[in-house]
Interface confidence: low
């Protein structure tokens, strides 16, 4: 017959898990001994492994709830294609029966005694209730039994007495104004209110109780501004170390306005928070070196050549500068002491020239002497030869810029009778006197 085939068997519950499908034979399903099968949906689950006894079930409930009874448990032969120990076929149940006793005895009902006397009325004035009781001991119940009905009953009672009226407080009156206008001063501001024992007043006959508690109460005022606190100086702090390692410096003492801190609009401390003193390290300060301006470029020459002037032959020239003024272990000058560049020499070369535009007017000379004048020039500027602007001096070092150097001899057409420089002079007007500004202030 076809069965439902599953991929797992759960030992603890005896249930089939992981439905593979139906319509297969037991033999085909159980080609894998880890599988399990059911003959019908919801039916007994049998594992495909060789048969063995399941775990014992838990004991069934005891057959009676009191005195001695008995209870059953079972186990099942589960598996396929074989037998459990004792030559038992799969699906067979094996039972165990044992004696049990949930409770040794069975409950028995008891009987009531007669009613006891009425207790006093629950109140001492006006109307109340009174109660009487009976005991469950005639006979006493056994083994957890009880008596039917109630153990007490009540009825109304009247004391024939008028009740006294006890006092109760009327509502509180308004709060009085605060005793101060700010908090934090010498007296803590308070407000007070009172009430009367008049809602109702206690009766005289019979005498009622007075109202409990106090007829007035006080509380701290809230929402008041804090009282101003004037600031006070703390002590002078230590003198700060001299902040310099050479020459003169300035040390400082500080004090803080925190004895107390001014608060709530109170005035700040009067006077200075710092005082200073000069300190002397008696050590001269280092002076860093500074480069002089570059010297003149050396003549443009090429090694092993007597002269390269007026030729399209690049040479080299250098200029130097001096690091001056370094004292007391100051820094040396940064950068190169020598500057080298490539050049074409046009020293004393006759070159065709053209007149420049007028230069801007120069300064008035002499600035403090009589009749200062200013001048401007037009220069006969040489037209430089169109040599290559860059050269490759050493293989693999790339192109180097080449600069023209030297004083050529420019040739221009005469201008106003001049060949090299035309100069125009003008007097400087409205010349102020040279005065030392320091002396002017005195």
């Amino acid at each position: 017959d076809p069965v439902l085939c599953f991929t797992q068997y759960e030992e603890s519950s005896g249930k089939c898990k992981g439905l593979l499908g139906g319509g297969v034979s037991v033999e085909d399903c159980c080609l894998n001994t880890a599988f399990a099968y059911q003959k019908r949906s919801g039916g007994l689950c049998q594992p495909c492994r060789s048969p063995r006894w399941s775990l014992w079930s838990t004991w069934a409930p005891c057959s009676v709830t009191c005195s001695e009874g008995s209870q059953l448990r079972y186990r099942r032969c589960v598996g396929w294609n074989g037998q459990c120990s004792g030559k038992v076929a799969p699906g067979t149940l094996e039972w165990q029966l044992q004696a049990c006793e949930d409770q040794q005895c069975c409950p028995e009902m008891g009987g009531w005694s007669g009613w006891g006397p009425w207790e006093p009325c629950s109140v001492t004035c006006s109307k109340g209730t009174r109660t009487r009781r009976r005991a469950c001991n005639h006979p006493a119940p056994k083994c957890g039994g009880h008596c039917p009905g109630q153990a007490q009953e009540s009825e109304a009672c009247d004391t024939q007495q008028v009740c006294p009226t006890h006092g109760a407080w009327a509502t509180w009156g308004p709060w009085t104004p605060c005793s101060a206008s700010c908090h934090g001063g010498p007296h803590e501001p308070k407000e007070t209110r009172s009430r009367k024992c008049s809602a109702p007043e206690p009766s005289q006959k019979p005498p009622g109780k007075p109202c409990p508690g106090l007829a007035y109460e006080q509380r701290r005022c809230t929402g008041l501004p804090p009282c101003p606190v004037a600031g006070g100086w703390g002590p002078w702090g230590p003198v700060s170390p001299c902040p310099v390692t050479c020459g003169l410096g300035q040390t400082m003492e500080q004090r803080t306005c925190n004895h107390p801190v001014p608060q709530h609009g109170g005035p700040f401390c009067a006077g200075d928070a710092t005082r200073t003193h000069i300190c002397n390290t008696a050590v001269p300060c280092p002076v860093d070196g500074e480069w002089d301006s570059w010297g003149e470029w050396s003549p443009c020459i090429r090694r092993n050549m007597k002269s390269i002037s007026c030729q399209e032959i690049p040479g080299q020239q250098s200029r130097g500068r001096t690091c001056r003024g370094r004292k007391f272990d100051g820094h040396r000058c940064a950068g190169q002491q020598q500057d080298i560049r490539h050049c074409y020499s046009i020293q004393h070369c006759p070159l065709k020239g053209s007149w420049s535009e007028w230069s801007t007017w120069g300064l008035c000379m002499p600035p403090c002497g009589p009749n200062p004048t200013r001048a401007r020039q037009r220069l006969c500027t040489p037209l430089l030869p169109k040599y290559p602007p860059t050269v490759s001096m050493v293989e693999g070092q790339g192109e180097k810029n080449v600069t023209f150097w030297g004083r050529p001899l420019p040739r221009c057409e005469e201008l106003q009778g001049q060949k090299l420089v035309v100069e125009e002079k003008r007097p400087c007007l409205h010349v102020p006197a040279c005065k030392d500004p320091e002396e002017e202030e005195l």
């Epitope: 053209s354 420049s356 535009e357 120069g362 500027t381 037209l383 430089l384 810029n401 420019p410």
Partner: nanobody
């Protein structure tokens, strides 16, 4: 000696504009031409534009039509107006001045060699894409 002080550099989006200024002080009567150079990281320094004392100008091909060099002789200042900036214009821009004594008037030859004798410190121009 002549001292040169550049200003006006900064960061700008592509297509934006900047105006660089270079103020000269010191022996300004010795200045003939003034120019702007630029150097991008890992590249050779190149002339961007320059202007002679007479006002004649020249420009690198890559900036023609976008950059304008001008000069205010009264203030001893040269300006470089840079419009339609491109990311490839990112570089350090350095102002240079030519000494009349040293080099004479080279610009009339169109000579592109660095015959400048005085140089500024440089100002960074960054054009972000």
């Amino acid at each position: 000696q002549v001292q040169l002080m550049e200003s006006g550099g900064g960061e700008v989006q592509a297509g934006g504009s900047l105006r660089l200024s270079c103020a000269a002080s010191g022996s300004i009567f010795d200045i003939s031409a003034m120019g702007w150079y630029r150097q991008a990281p890992g590249k050779q320094r190149e002339l961007v534009a320059d202007i002679t004392s007479s006002g004649s100008t020249q420009y690198a091909d890559s900036v023609k039509g976008r950059f304008t060099i001008s000069r205010d002789n009264a203030k001893n200042t040269v300006y470089l107006q840079m419009n339609s900036l491109k990311p490839e214009d990112t570089a350090v821009y350095t102002c240079a001045a030519e000494s009349i004594r040293e080099s004479q008037n080279r610009h009339q030859l169109g000579y592109m060699g660095p015959l400048y004798d005085y140089w500024g410190q440089g100002t960074q121009v960054t054009v972000s894409g």
